[in-house]
């Protein structure tokens, strides 16, 4: 269509097409006609003399783009109790549900909503929550480095440094803190040596860990049982 604004409906000139974003070509009328704006649908298609008649979407229905739909789309069903609504259903947009705090999305659908909100994995003693997450948003566990420990099973706790002792009673390891000996009053004049305990070797498997996608290093998945899958998850 030439650069000037043309009111619909109009017959496209040879070699020109309708303006694709807000117009469509009606084969029956052989005219360029107006699409309906977001939030509306086609009540009556155009003809040679009158343009498209649009109407508002009804409750719980929407259209998100300029369209020539005969009906609006249905909004996704209400969010479940495992989810929170992050975008409401309006005439112009679908409802979007996300996982509630303490959960991650193990299966995201193309509507943008989550089909499977799973509890965040827990890292067992000797393992802390890594600073990065798996691509699906789940917790990643990492073995506590020398000088650090975690004695909890948690989806939030990181490895913490061992306490520093003047006199070391029991060295710490990956899953326990160091134990300091009580200071003897008779030794108070002696220069002190500070002890930072070194951990014992740690076990290499996190507990209750859900996966990230297959292109990342696999993490063992288990629900309190011997894991059988090193799980990868992904939405569409």
């Amino acid at each position: 269509v030439p650069a000037q604004v043309v009111l619909t409906p109009y017959k496209p000139e040879p070699g020109y097409e309708c303006q694709i974003s807000q117009e469509y070509y009606d084969r029956k009328a052989q005219m360029c006609c107006a699409k309906c704006p977001p939030g509306q649908y086609v009540k009556h298609f155009c003809n040679k003399t009158s343009d498209t008649v649009c109407a508002d979407c009804e409750a719980s229905m929407y259209t998100q783009v300029w369209n020539q739909f005969r009906t609006c789309l249905s909004c996704s069903s209400s969010c479940t109790t495992d989810q929170v609504e992050i975008r409401a259903c309006t005439k112009q947009q679908n409802r979007v549900c996300a996982c509630e705090a303490g959960r991650y999305c193990a299966l995201k659908t193309h509507s943008g909503s989550c089909r499977q909100c799973m509890r965040l994995s827990k890292c067992g003693p000797g393992f802390g929550v890594a600073s990065s997450r798996a691509p699906n948003g789940n917790v990643l566990c990492k073995a506590c480095a020398p000088g650090t420990f975690s004695d909890t099973t948690s989806s939030t706790d990181v490895c913490r440094p061992h306490r520093i002792c003047s006199i070391l009673a029991i060295p710490g390891n990956a899953s326990t803190d160091a134990v300091c000996a009580p200071e003897s009053p008779t030794l108070s004049a002696i220069p002190r040596t500070l002890y930072v305990s070194q951990p014992e070797p740690t076990r290499s498997q996190p507990l209750d860990q859900e996966p990230g996608p297959s292109q990342t290093p696999s993490i063992l998945t288990s629900l309190g049982s011997t894991p059988i899958i090193e799980q990868s998850t992904k939405g569409g």
């Epitope: 479940t80 193990a106 499977q116 799973m118 629900l223 899958i229």
Partner: antibody
């Protein structure tokens, strides 16, 4: 060792009801998503229903929606499938399973046969 | 008719390599969702064989492998053994149906 044991199957007349149970052990049941899958005699697998760990999210196949209800009792480590208005086409072995993240059923029960016939 | 199409049967002799296909559409495999494979030995419950296209659960021999490309996925079994005789099913999430879907199953026969 993970174990899933279904019970409650049997012969029922069309229009009748049945409640299947699935007793779970060997894993933290309250952390697990669960599912029911069925298999008609000599046929393939058909997904029936899913349930989230808390019981807050329930999903059904169109073929059973409005007739079947999935539920769980985390204190008893048991999954249920209440089946109402049964039809001949509901005749199948019903399996309960544990859903891993992203959807694969990583453990299956041995199944219980439901026969709907007059 | 199943949303995922599998050949009804496949066969091979011991030691051979056999491939089973699973063809879907743009609303399931082609949409990027992960494909899972199950093995069902005669008279038993299904068992997870491959998850997330190509991942093997612990205990599954590395003779079994999975792959995915476009709107199709395939399961390959190398070094075929008599105990591999079973039904094999693929499964994936389908966006347009808003449900899990299974292939119709492939009955694998080990000859000889």
């Amino acid at each position: 060792e993970v174990q899933l044991l279904e019970s409650g199957g049997g012969l029922v007349q069309p229009g009748g009801s049945l409640r299947l149970s699935c007793a779970a052990s060997g894993f933290t049941f309250s952390d697990a998503w669960m599912t029911w899958v069925r298999q008609a005699p000599g046929k393939g697998l058909e997904w029936v229903s899913d349930l989230s760990d808390s019981g807050g999210s329930t999903y059904y196949a169109d073929s059973v929606k409005g007739r079947f209800t999935i539920s769980r009792d985390n204190s008893k480590n048991t999954l249920y499938l209440q089946m109402n208005s049964l039809r001949a086409e509901d005749t199948a072995v019903y399996y309960c399973g544990r859903l891993a993240a992203g959807g694969p059923v990583d453990y299956w029960g041995q199944g219980t046969l439901v026969t709907v016939s007059s | 008719q199943s949303v995922l199409t599998q050949p009804p049967s496949a066969s091979g002799t011991p030691g051979q390599r056999v491939t089973i296909s699973c063809t879907g559409s743009s609303s399931n495999i082609g949409a990027g969702y992960d494909v899972h494979w199950y093995q069902q030995l005669p008279g038993t419950a299904p068992k997870l064989l491959i998850y997330s296209n190509n991942q093997r659960p612990s205990g599954v021999p590395d003779r079994f492998s999975g792959s995915k490309s476009g709107t199709s996925a395939s399961l390959a079994i190398s070094g075929l053994r008599s105990e591999d005789e079973a039904d094999y099913y693929c499964s994936v999430w389908d966006d347009s149906l808003n449900s899990w879907v299974f292939g119709g199953g492939t009955k694998l026969t080990v000859l000889g």
